[in-house]
C-alpha cells in the first residue's frame, strides 16, 4: 500500500538508485502501488538488461516510480526522453513483442527540461 | 567475410564449471548482439541468452538465470559464455549465433561452429 | 513464453518431390517467424525470414507463407542437398522460441 496524497520513499530496488528518492502512486498507469508498478516493470527488464538506451533506466523509473515533489505533484517523464528511448530501443521493442502502454506513447507526453519537470496533480488526473 | 568461431570440445565433471568462446570476424563486432544457443544430443535448440558486445550488457532465459554469466572482450572480439554447476543435462552443443539486423527485427544470421560440453562422472 | 510447434517431426521425400513443413505458434507472432536449417554435425543456417523473405544465397525453390499463428515453408522441388532438419523460430516474443524440427529424409 501506499500514503495517500504524500510521498512515499521508493522501495523498487531498480529505481532506488535514481537521483530522486520519493514516489507517489497511482502512477501514468494507473498503478496503484510500488509492488504492482515492479512487476509490470518486468516485461520492460530485457530493455533495461541490454541497456538499449543510456536513458532506459531513468525513463522506466520515471515512467513506473514517478518522482515526487511538493507531496502531492507527480512527475511523469518528458517527451523527449521518452523519444530518444523509443527510438534507440524500438528494434529490440519489436523483436522481444514488449507492448508500450498507451499512457507511455511519447506524443501524450509533454515537452519539458528534465531538470526542471511540469507535474500534474493527481487528484485531478485520475480522480477526476 | 562474417566468421564465429568458437573453442573446442570439453569434458567436464558434474558441479564444475565451463567457458566457451566464440571469436569474431569480417564485421564490426560492437554493432551486433550475440547470442547463446544450446543444443542437446538428438534434441531441438535452446536459446540461453544474449549479450550486447558494445556494453557488455546481457539478458538471459530464466532457465539460466543464476547459472550463465555471458561477457565480451572487445579488443579480441570475442564473447565468452560461462556456465556454472554443470550437470549431465547440459551436455550439448552450444553456439553463439550473431543477430542480424533485418529491417524491424533481429534473426540470427550467422552461427559459431558449435563446441560440444560433455558433463559426465 | 510462446510455443513453437512443428509438423510433421520427420518426413520422407524424394528428389524432385514438393514438399511442405508447418509450423505453429501458442500465439499470433504477425509475420515475425524464421526457418533454419541444420545439417548433421553442423551448426543452423538461416534460410526465410519475416516469414517468406528468402535469406541472400538461399535457392528460390525455398519460400515461406503464413501469419499470425500458422506458417508453412515449402520446397518446391527437393535438391540431394536439401535433406536435413528444418527448424521455425519466433522473434516476436521475449525469449526467441524454436519449434522442435522436422527431420527431411530420403525416402
Known amino acids: 500500500g501506499h500514503s495517500l496524497f504524500t510521498c512515499e520513499p521508493i522501495t523498487v530496488p531498480r529505481c532506488m538508485k535514481m537521483a530522486y528518492n520519493m514516489t507517489f502512486f497511482p502512477n501514468l498507469m494507473g498503478h496503484y502501488d510500488q509492488s504492482i508498478a515492479a512487476v509490470e516493470m518486468e516485461h520492460f527488464l530485457p530493455l533495461a538488461n541490454l541497456e538499449c538506451s543510456p536513458n532506459i533506466e531513468t525513463f522506466l523509473c520515471k515512467a513506473f516510480v514517478p518522482t515526487c515533489i511538493e507531496q502531492i505533484h507527480v512527475v511523469p517523464p518528458c517527451r523527449k526522453l521518452c523519444e530518444k528511448v523509443y527510438s534507440d530501443c524500438k528494434k529490440l521493442i519489436d523483436t522481444f513483442g514488449i507492448r508500450w502502454p498507451e499512457e507511455l506513447e511519447c506524443d501524450r507526453l509533454q515537452y519539458c527540461d528534465e531538470t526542471v519537470p511540469v507535474t500534474f496533480d493527481p487528484h485531478t488526473e485520475f480522480l477526476g | 567475410q562474417v566468421q564465429l568461431v568458437q573453442s573446442g570440445a570439453e569434458v567436464k565433471k558434474p558441479g564444475a564449471s565451463v567457458k566457451v568462446s566464440c571469436k569474431a570476424s569480417g564485421y564490426t563486432f560492437t554493432s551486433y548482439y550475440m547470442n547463446w544457443v544450446r543444443q542437446a544430443p538428438g534434441q531441438g535448440l535452446e536459446w540461453m541468452g544474449i549479450i550486447s558486445p558494445s556494453g557488455g550488457s546481457t539478458s538471459y532465459a530464466q532457465k539460466f538465470q543464476g547459472r550463465v554469466t555471458m561477457t565480451r572482450d572487445t579488443s579480441t572480439s570475442t564473447v565468452y559464455m560461462e556456465l556454472s554447476s554443470l550437470r549431465s543435462e547440459d551436455t550439448a552443443v552450444y553456439y553463439c549465433?550473431?543477430?542480424?539486423?533485418?529491417?524491424?527485427?533481429?534473426?540470427?544470421?550467422?552461427w559459431g561452429q558449435g563446441t560440444l560440453v560433455t558433463v559426465s562422472s | 513464453d510462446i510455443q513453437m510447434t512443428q509438423s510433421p517431426s520427420s518426413l520422407s521425400a524424394s528428389v524432385g518431390d514438393r514438399v511442405t513443413i508447418t509450423c505453429r505458434a501458442s500465439?499470433?507472432?504477425?509475420?515475425?517467424l524464421a526457418w533454419y536449417q541444420q545439417k548433421p554435425g553442423k551448426a543452423p543456417k538461416l534460410l526465410i525470414y519475416a516469414t517468406s523473405t528468402l535469406q541472400s544465397g538461399v535457392p528460390s525453390r525455398f519460400s515461406g507463407s503464413g501469419s499470425g499463428t500458422d506458417f508453412t515453408l515449402t520446397i518446391s522441388s527437393l535438391q540431394p542437398e536439401d535433406f536435413a532438419t528444418y527448424y521455425c523460430?519466433?522473434?516476436?516474443?521475449?525469449?526467441?522460441?524454436f519449434g522442435q524440427g522436422t527431420k527431411l529424409e530420403i525416402k
Open positions: 523460430q519466433q522473434v516476436n516474443s521475449y525469449p526467441p522460441t
Open positions: 549465433a550473431r543477430w542480424g539486423d533485418y529491417g524491424d527485427l533481429y534473426y540470427f544470421d550467422y
Open positions: 500465439q499470433g507472432i504477425s509475420s515475425a
